[in-house]
Amino acid sequence: GPETLCGAELVDALQFVCGPRGFYFNKPTGYGSSIRRAPQTGIVDECCFRSCDLRRLEMYCAPLKPTKAA
C-alpha cells in the first residue's frame, strides 16, 4: 500500500521501479497536465511529505528510449 519514502530509501525505490530508464526528481517540463498543482512540486514533495504508491513513483521515471530498428 501507499507509504512515505524519504532520502536514500526513496532513491532506492525509484531505481527499482524505473530500472535502466532512470528517473527525475522533478517531472520534465511539459509532462502531463498543464494545470499541475505547482511547477516546483517533485517526487520528494509527493512521496516524502505524504504517502505515495507505485503509480506515483512511475510518473517520475524517464521515458523509454525508442529502440532503433535493425
Partner: antibody, heavy 119, light 112 residues
Framework: QVQLQESGPGLVKPSETLSLTCTVS????????WSWIRQPPGRGLEWIGY???????NYNPSLKSRVTMSVDTSKNQFSLKLSSVTAADTAVYYC?????????????WGQGATVTVSS | QSVLTQAPSVSGAPGQRVTISCTGR?????????VHWYQQFPGTAPKLLIY???NRPSGVPDRFSGSKSGTSASLAITGLQAEDEADYYC???????????FGGGTKLTVLG
Amino acid sequence: QVQLQESGPGLVKPSETLSLTCTVSGGSISSYYWSWIRQPPGRGLEWIGYFFYSGYTNYNPSLKSRVTMSVDTSKNQFSLKLSSVTAADTAVYYCACITGTTKGGMDVWGQGATVTVSS
Amino acid sequence: QSVLTQAPSVSGAPGQRVTISCTGRSSNIGAGYDVHWYQQFPGTAPKLLIYGNSNRPSGVPDRFSGSKSGTSASLAITGLQAEDEADYYCQSYDSSLSGSVFGGGTKLTVLG
C-alpha cells in the same frame, strides 16, 4: 546518531551575503534530506529551503531569489548563502535533517547560529 | 501571517489536559500532507515531538499525542507537567507554495 553543527560569521553588513555551513557527523550526507530554518528574535520558525545531495532543491518562494544551498560531500558539509541581506534577516539559523524514519519530520537539528545584520 | 494557524497561547494547571490546534487548508493539511509537531524551550533548538500526524519519536512520553482531521491537526498533552512549558509549532507541506510551512507557534504556560 546524526549530529549537526552550524558555523559562520555572527555579524553581516547590510547588502552583503550571509554564509553558513552545517557540518554533519555520525551519518552520510548522501542518505538524507537537509534543511535550513530560521527564527527571528522573539518570533516563530521560518522554513528557508531543503535539498537532497543529488541536486534536488526547494526554496521558500519569499526567499528564493536570494538563497543558494550547496553540498560538499567530501567534507560532509552543506551550506547556505543568503544575498542582499537586511536587518529583517537577523535571526537564529538552524540546519536540520530529515532522516526518512519520521515521514518528512525534521528529526535532527543543529544548536543554531545567531546572525545579526548590522552596519 | 502564517499559512498554518495556531493560537498564540494556551495554559493549564499541572495534571490537566491541554490541546493545541493547527488549522490549515486544502493545499496543505487537507491535501494529505503529514503534520509534524515541534517543542522548543527558550534559547534551544526545536525538537521533533510528533511526526506523521500521530507518531512519537523514541523518548517522547506518551502524554503527548497528535491527531489530524480534514484541514486541521491537534496536539494533546495529558497530565500536564511544569517541564512542558515551552513553545509548540506545527509544520506541514503546502503544494500551492511548493514548500514546507510552519504554524506561528503556541506558547504553553503551566499554571501554579
